[in-house]
């Protein structure tokens, strides 16, 4: 056969569908690979051909469009399953061609099973709701194109295994589920089951998404540096290890990039010659507020290093802040005999500061 532009296996489109439910799958050629749509291609005399390789086989075979009740059919650039079966899992190829032109792409289709509580290997979209923010809604996703607007489906919403009805905080409203005031207890998996008739048969579409209740923008603040602070002095002798934590709290902000960095004498640690290491750890609260800690470490500090300026910086969409660490060289305590000779009491170092020895 003549050459065909083969876009290979499009693993970015890992399509997952539920067993025993309708599925409509658009040929990815027109969505991601070609600069024209199906109508243009069809008008130009190009034909769309479908075939597949079933799971654990190498053999490409045509799709059987003559199954009872047209279980698998093609409509324009869409491959329809009414409904899917478990053994429909495999790699599907759509090929657009005429006598002079050919382009094709393959994509994996996985038919997955769900349990009585809608658990499955399906990757779930995550919808974030702001805590105590007023009415917010989630919408039953990916149901467009399955039935005409003249058909009025029934929609049932579940949290886990349990139907949502007459609940004071969460209200089903057709394709939408309204959260009057989102609380942490609303975290979880929510499922809409859309039931519609077609040619004397009843079909179900199951769509599950994860709701995560996050910090509200009403409560968001610029980054807060908890450490370094004015109460702690890092007092070291040359040769000791210097460890300074920079601990920063970030309010949750949708799509915000949280950054923490150190400067030493105004320069990034990478841009100076001293042997410094930075270790970062990140933790999250239940509402996805973030605490980042960057520990600056100099294994064997010199008296020169103890004169430098160590500043922790933090930035989010809410603003930028900075705080200098108080670093000083420990003054050796005067020898006891000298103190007596000079008439002083033995009072220790007398610095009054916190001596932090981080291990």
């Amino acid at each position: 056969s003549e050459r065909c532009d083969d876009w290979g296996l499009d693993t970015m489109r890992q399509i997952q569908v539920f067993e025993d439910e309708p599925a409509r799958i658009k040929c990815p050629l027109f969505e991601h690979f070609l600069k024209f749509n199906y109508s243009t291609a069809h008008s130009a005399g190009l034909t769309l051909i479908w075939y597949w390789t079933r799971q654990d086989r190498d053999l490409e075979e045509p799709i059987n469009f003559r199954l009872p009740e047209n279980r698998i059919s093609k409509e324009k650039d869409v491959l329809w399953f009414r409904p899917t079966l478990l053994n429909d899992t495999g790699n599907y190829t759509c090929m657009l061609r005429n006598t002079t032109y050919c382009s094709k792409v393959a994509f994996p289709l996985e038919v997955v099973q769900k349990d009585s509580c809608f658990n499955s290997p399906m990757k779930l979209p995550v919808h974030k709701l702001y805590i105590e923010y007023g009415i917010q809604r989630i919408t039953c996703p990916n149901v467009d194109g399955y039935f005409p607007s003249s058909v009025k489906p029934t929609i049932t919403w579940y949290m886990g295994c349990y139907k949502i009805q007459n609940f004071n905080n969460v209200i089903p409203e057709g394709m939408n589920l309204s959260f009057l005031i989102a609380l942490i207890s609303n975290n979880g998996n929510y499922t809409c089951v859309v039931t519609y008739p077609e040619n004397g048969r009843t079909f179900h579409l199951t769509r599950t998404l994860t709701v995560k209740v996050v910090g509200s923008p009403k409560n968001a603040v610029p980054p807060v540096i908890h450490s370094p602070n004015d109460h702690v002095v890092y007092e070291k002798e040359p040769g000791e290890e210097l460890l300074i934590p920079c601990t920063v709290y970030f309010s949750f902000l949708m799509d915000s990039r949280n950054e923490v960095w150190w400067t030493i004498d105004g320069k990034k640690p990478d841009d100076i010659t001293i042997d410094v290491t930075i270790n970062e750890s990140i933790s999250h609260s239940r509402t996805e507020d973030e605490t980042r800690t960057q520990i600056l470490s100099i294994k064997k500090v010199t008296s020169e290093d103890l004169k430098r300026s160590y500043v922790c910086h933090a930035r989010s969409a809410k603003g930028e802040v900075a705080k200098a660490a108080k670093v000083k060289q420990k003054v050796p305590a005067p020898r006891y005999t000298v103190e007596l000779a000079c008439g002083f009491g033995a009072t220790g170092s007398g610095s009054g500061s916190h001596h932090h020895h981080h291990h």
Partner: antibody
Framework: QVQLVQSGAEVKKPGSSVKVSCKAS????????ISWVRQAPGQGLEWMGG????????NYAQKFQGRVTITADESTSTAYMELSSLRSEDTAVYYC????????????WGQGTLVTVSS | EIVLTQSPATLSLSPGERATLSCRAS??????LAWYQQKPGQAPRLLIY???NRATGIPARFSGSGSGTDFTLTISSLEPEDFAVYYC?????????FGQGTKVEIK
């Protein structure tokens, strides 16, 4: 740690009703669901139904539909199972068990409540 | 409803021996299956969920395998405290159902 404490043993007459309680502690009650499972003497386990602690909606096994009512009181972290029109074959140990809202396995169980139906 | 059939009904073994318990479903339950242990006068205890995941605090000698209709619970080396009745349970379809149990007794 998580504990489910059930009410005490009951002796009931045929045709009457019984209501068994299950008080949860050591976890966030509203984050879980409670199922009820029964076990007749010397027999296996039988799932009766379950309830979402937060939504108060229940799922029932067809066999018990119309005869069993499962409820939950979030304020006291307590679930209840009421079985009506009792017959001698309802004599069993009734267990409550906790699971996630979307969990299908029962990770913590109550100690069981023996209900004896006898004339 | 889905019927779970456990075999054998009774398994007579000595401490240190390997126990293999079977659970067969009347139709596919994928991997939506759990195993429980019950000792006389006690409530059941979750051992395995998702066909092969050990529950919190369950010793490594307990393992589960299988998918679809055939499942196995294996106790690699029986300890005295393992002699009990074991039940499988499916959550693929309503109502959730249990097998009739396998009794593991001391030989």
């Amino acid at each position: 740690q998580v504990q489910l404490v059930q009410s005490g043993a009951e002796v009931k007459k045929p045709g009457s009703s019984v209501k068994v309680s299950c008080k949860a502690s050591g976890g966030t009650f509203s984050s879980y669901a409670i199922s009820w499972v029964r076990q007749a003497p010397g027999q296996g386990l039988e799932w009766m139904g379950g309830i979402s602690a937060i939504f108060g909606t229940a799922n029932y096994a067809q066999k018990f539909q119309g005869r069993v009512t499962i409820t939950a009181d979030e304020s006291t972290s307590t679930a209840y199972m009421e079985l009506s029109s009792l017959r001698s074959e309802d004599t069993a140990v009734y267990y409550c068990a906790r699971h996630l809202h979307n969990g299908i396995h029962l990770d913590y169980w109550g100690q069981g409540t023996l209900v004896t139906v006898s004339s | 409803e889905i019927v779970l059939t456990q075999s054998p009904a009774t398994l007579s073994l000595s401490p240190g021996e390997r126990a293999t318990l079977s659970c067969r479903a009347s139709q596919s339950v994928s991997n939506f299956l759990a195993w429980y242990q019950q000792k006389p006068g006690q409530a059941p205890r979750l051992l395995i969920y998702g066909a092969s995941n050990r529950a919190t605090g369950i010793p490594a000698r307990f393992s589960g395998s299988g998918s679809g209709t055939d499942f196995t619970l294996t106790i690699s080396s029986l300890e005295p405290e393992d002699f009990a009745v074991y039940y499988c349970q499916q959550g693929k379809h309503w109502p959730w159902t249990f097998g009739q149990g396998t009794k593991v007794e001391i030989k």
